[in-house]
């Protein structure tokens, strides 16, 4: 892992005035033991609205690595394997919570942050605007 | 909001022996100010693999409300508006981090938890298993 240099301005973990602060145990409990992680691993390629996954890394964030989906085409793949521009590939986005080191480089102090990520793509019928 | 009764067994926020614990400021910073939250609000209906959104509420979790997608059909909607079972609607899943109150009902003590959620659905070509 990346070693983060300690910022001398980091707040004291015991500071009672630290705003709206809670203690969080970072030993992650994984509730997904019953699901098969490989189940959706090839959907990005088999979808009629395929996507590529891009690695987004930020050592000041936890988790430091997030994968972002980008739709490969504006249209969708039809039965012949061609792109049909009468349909639209669009990203399915989700707001997720991450932990941001605050102040920067502090090993034991974070702030909750909400970020929008694209998880994959879906094929939708376009909204057609009829011009008078 | 729901008021959580305080558990008398809650750890002391200043306990230096609390395992792998960090301080987290719950004043959420939202990085999504430039995005239009309504942009993808109707994709669930316009998709060729439409889905419904179900509210999952748990006061012991932060965030307490998570919306889960369930694909409406096994197949995908074709150009005629009918379900084509030669294609598959599949859930796009993502592992996300949430905070779980630990011990239960503690207002200032959490543990990171990883859960699998379905964000929406996409239409994929099935893997056909040819039987000898």
């Amino acid at each position: 892992g990346i070693t983060i240099p300690r910022n001398p301005g980091c707040p004291n973990s015991e500071d009672k005035n630290f705003p709206r602060t809670v203690m969080v145990n970072l030993n992650i409990h994984n509730r997904n033991t019953n699901t098969n992680p490989k189940r959706s691993s090839d959907y990005y390629n088999r979808s009629t609205s395929p996507w590529n996954l891009h690695r987004n890394e930020d050592p000041e964030r936890y988790p430091s690595v997030i994968w972002e989906a980008k739709c490969r085409h504006l249209g969708c793949i039809n039965a012949d394997g061609n792109v049909d521009y009468h349909m639209n590939s669009v990203p399915i986005q989700q707001e997720i919570l991450v932990l941001r080191r605050e102040p920067p480089h502090c090993p034991n102090s974070f702030r909750l942050e909400k970020i929008l990520v694209s998880v994959g793509c879906t094929c939708v019928t376009p909204i057609v605007h009829h011009v008078a | 909001g729901i008021t959580i009764p305080r558990n008398p067994g809650c750890p002391n926020s200043e306990d230096k022996n609390f395992p792998r614990t960090v301080m987290v400021n719950l004043n959420i910073h939202n990085r999504n100010t430039n995005t239009n939250p309504k942009r993808s609000s109707d994709y669930y209906n316009r998709s060729t693999s439409p889905w419904n959104l179900h509210r999952n509420e748990d006061p012991e979790r932060y965030p307490s409300v998570i919306w889960e997608a369930k694909c409406r059909h096994l197949g995908c909607i074709n150009a005629d508006g009918n379900v084509d079972y030669h294609m598959n609607s599949v859930p796009i899943q993502q592992e996300i981090l949430v905070l779980r109150r630990e011990p239960p009902h503690c207002p200032n003590s959490f543990r990171l938890e990883k859960i699998l959620v379905s964000v929406g659905c996409t239409c994929v070509t099935p893997i056909v298993h040819h039987v000898a």
Partner: nanobody, 119 residues
């Protein structure tokens, strides 16, 4: 049209065994995780067991772990539930369906198969 036809139920004594079958048609069976559910009189339908795509993994309700085994045969578009060491509390109508965590399944329920365990 999606069809799920369950069979293999019956009356059995406590401690006995049964093997349920569910024949699926009308969709690409091999592409979906499949589950067995049950509904006892006056109770809500509950998840019993799930088998993932390709049979790669299985998952069971705590109440049946170690006694029931779910499996699938994609060549026959069939999912099975082997039930051993049956108890009176296993008495219910058993149904198969796709995994209801990820799909709206209300349109697909079959007629189910009755399992009755006498003490």
């Amino acid at each position: 049209e999606v069809q799920l036809v369950e069979s293999g139920g019956g009356l059995v004594q406590s401690g006995g065994s049964l093997r349920l079958s569910c024949a699926a048609s009308g969709f690409t069976f091999s592409s979906y995780a499949m589950s067995w559910y049950r509904q006892a009189p006056g109770k809500e339908r509950e998840l019993v067991a799930t088998v993932e795509i390709g049979g790669s993994s299985t998952n069971y309700a705590d109440s049946v772990k170690g006694r029931f085994t779910i499996s699938r045969d994609d060549a026959k578009n069939t999912v099975y539930l082997q039930m051993n060491s049956l108890k009176p509390e296993d008495t219910a109508v058993y149904y198969c369906n796709v995994d209801w965590k990820w799909y709206e399944v209300d349109d697909y329920w079959g007629q189910g198969t009755q399992v009755t365990v006498s003490s």
